[in-house]
């Protein structure tokens, strides 16, 4: 029961996270005009990964796409790539995890296959979350660098008379959405990996141990056949984990701790 809950929760958390990564990638407010210590302008500038926008006090908003690939900064291209990779991996992970869900029966799918699929989707979610966090962090670092550079030469002009006020940009809403979404996807992935451990079927979890009976050189595998030695007599409802016997319920209620990034 605990495995199903962990897997289901991991799926839902990852789903929310990937939806957030998609939303962040599409949002226009990756960087917004810094209004602090700036003359009050009647124009508000903000930029996304795909276009830049200007909102006038009149209420009119004009957005222009970046209709060039070669002319864009390499860092922006890198951020785009990271976010897209994150979305693609996340989407594939979601697809895989749907079939891996314990509550969904698809034909005669083996438990081992479900465990493998759960692990695969978990790893995909972790990488997806890391890609999003990395992409957003790279962009944030780029903003911080540009912010201080533009602050250093904010006022340019002749003879002290101010001619141009340079527009400075600060963190936009998309960055926070991206960080949170990346974190959720990462957590969801970790939960899926934890759930995978409890999903593994009996055969894959047995450890082959050689038992040497005195006077006989016969190797026994627990539960293989019922010998008078007493081994295997009640292994039917038990799984052997690292030499310790636990009931099926005990195995499923694996402890988990979730730290939010």
């Amino acid at each position: 029961m605990a495995v199903t809950a962990c897997q289901g929760l991991g799926f839902v958390v990852s789903l929310i996270g990937i939806a957030g990564i998609i939303a962040a990638t599409c949002m226009d407010q990756w960087s917004t005009q810094d209004l602090y210590n700036n003359p009050v302008t009647a124009v508000f500038n903000y930029q996304g990964l795909w276009r830049s926008c200007v909102r006038e006090s009149s209420g009119f908003t004009e957005c222009r796409g970046y209709f060039t690939l070669l002319g864009l900064p390499a860092m922006l291209q890198a951020v785009r790539a990271l976010m897209i990779v994150g979305i693609v991996l996340g989407a594939i992970g979601l697809l895989v995890s749907i079939f891996a869900l314990k509550c969904i029966r698809i034909g005669s799918m083996e438990d081992s296959a479900k465990a493998n699929m759960t692990l695969t989707s978990g790893i995909m979610f972790i990488v997806s979350g890391l890609c999003a966090i990395a992409g957003v962090s790279v962009f944030a670092n780029m903003l911080v660098t540009n912010f201080w550079m533009s602050t250093a030469n904010m006022y340019t002009g002749m003879g002290g008379m101010v001619q141009t006020v340079q527009t400075r940009y600060t963190f936009g809403a998309a960055l926070f959405v991206g960080w949170v979404a990346g974190g959720l996807t990462l957590i969801g992935g970790v939960m899926m990996c934890i759930a995978c451990r409890g999903l593994a079927p009996e055969e894959t979890n047995y450890k082959a141990v050689s038992y040497h009976a005195s006077g006989h050189s016969v190797a026994y595998k627990p539960g293989g056949f019922k010998a008078s030695t007493g081994f295997g007599s009640n292994t039917k409802n038990k799984k052997i984990y690292d030499g310790g016997a636990r009931t099926e319920d005990e195995v499923q209620s694996y402890p988990s701790k979730h730290d939010y990034v």
């Epitope: 005009q33 003359p39 009050v40 302008t41 009647a42 124009v43 500038n45 930029q47 830049s52 926008c53 200007v54 006038e56 006090s57 009149s58 209420g59 009119f60 004009e62 222009r64 101010v162 001619q163 141009t164 006020v165 340079q166 527009t167």
Partner: antibody
């Protein structure tokens, strides 16, 4: 067609208040910001402030902050400008105008002459 | 506040001749976000309300004759009437639409010589 029709001329005593109305027609009132500009006799144009009828957000020129109040009535498609503590230098033609691209004013009212005289 | 200075204060030009009005702002009106200059030109004929001629410094408002042209960037702007007509007699104002409070130039009176 798109037009802004202002209320009639007003004669007020110093210290009194005046409320000028500006009725919009021919367009969706809440989609455009309404600005107020005044022009003293023989003088240039002076921006007073604006109101966004959609959310009642307003901004004032420092000179009119606290003395001018911009409001709007969505149901009546009308914007109002109230100026209190009138002085002789407030005698002017008051215009309402609609905000357009580039924060420019594309449609203007005919103007309301406010005379301040004791 | 941004100071808008127009020159000359008044201008007398013969019919069919070119009229040029300059406008200088104390700060740049160029927005880096869209590379547009937030300067507007208005025409006010005697006894009438102002009329929009150009926004974004050079974008002509619909219905404005093409003998009118707007140019300039940053702090220096120009309104040109290529061939003055009798109906162009008016006061012309430039306006800062970038910084609050929006400020107007003192106006340039165009007359026929």
């Amino acid at each position: 067609q798109v037009q802004l029709v202002e209320s009639g001329a007003e004669v007020k005593k110093p210290g009194a208040s005046v409320k000028v109305s500006c009725k919009a027609s021919g367009y969706t009132f809440t989609s455009y910001v309404v600005h107020w500009v005044r022009q003293a006799p023989g003088q240039g144009l002076e921006w007073m402030g604006y109101i966004n009828p959609y959310n009642a957000d307003s901004k004032y020129s420092q000179e009119f902050q606290g003395r001018a109040t911009l409001t709007s009535d969505k149901s009546a498609s009308t914007a109002y400008m109230e100026l209190s503590s009138l002085r002789s230098e407030d005698m002017a033609v008051y215009y309402c105008s609609r905000s357009y691209y580039g924060n420019s004013f594309d449609v203007w009212g005919q103007g309301t002459l406010v005379t301040v005289s004791s | 506040d941004i100071v808008m200075t127009q020159s000359p204060d008044s201008l007398a030009v013969s019919l069919g001749e070119r009229a040029t009005i300059n406008c200088k702002s104390s700060q740049s009106l160029l927005n880096s976000g869209n590379q547009k200059n937030y300067l507007t030109w208005y025409q006010q004929k005697p006894g009438q309300s102002p009329k929009l001629l150009f926004f974004w410094a050079s974008t002509r408002q619909s219905g404005v004759p093409d003998r009118f042209s707007g140019s300039g960037s940053g702090t220096d702007f120009t309104l040109t009437i290529s061939s003055l007509q009798a109906e162009d007699v008016a006061v012309y104002y430039c306006q800062n639409d970038y910084y609050f409070p929006f400020t107007f130039g003192q106006g340039t009176k165009v007359e026929i010589k």
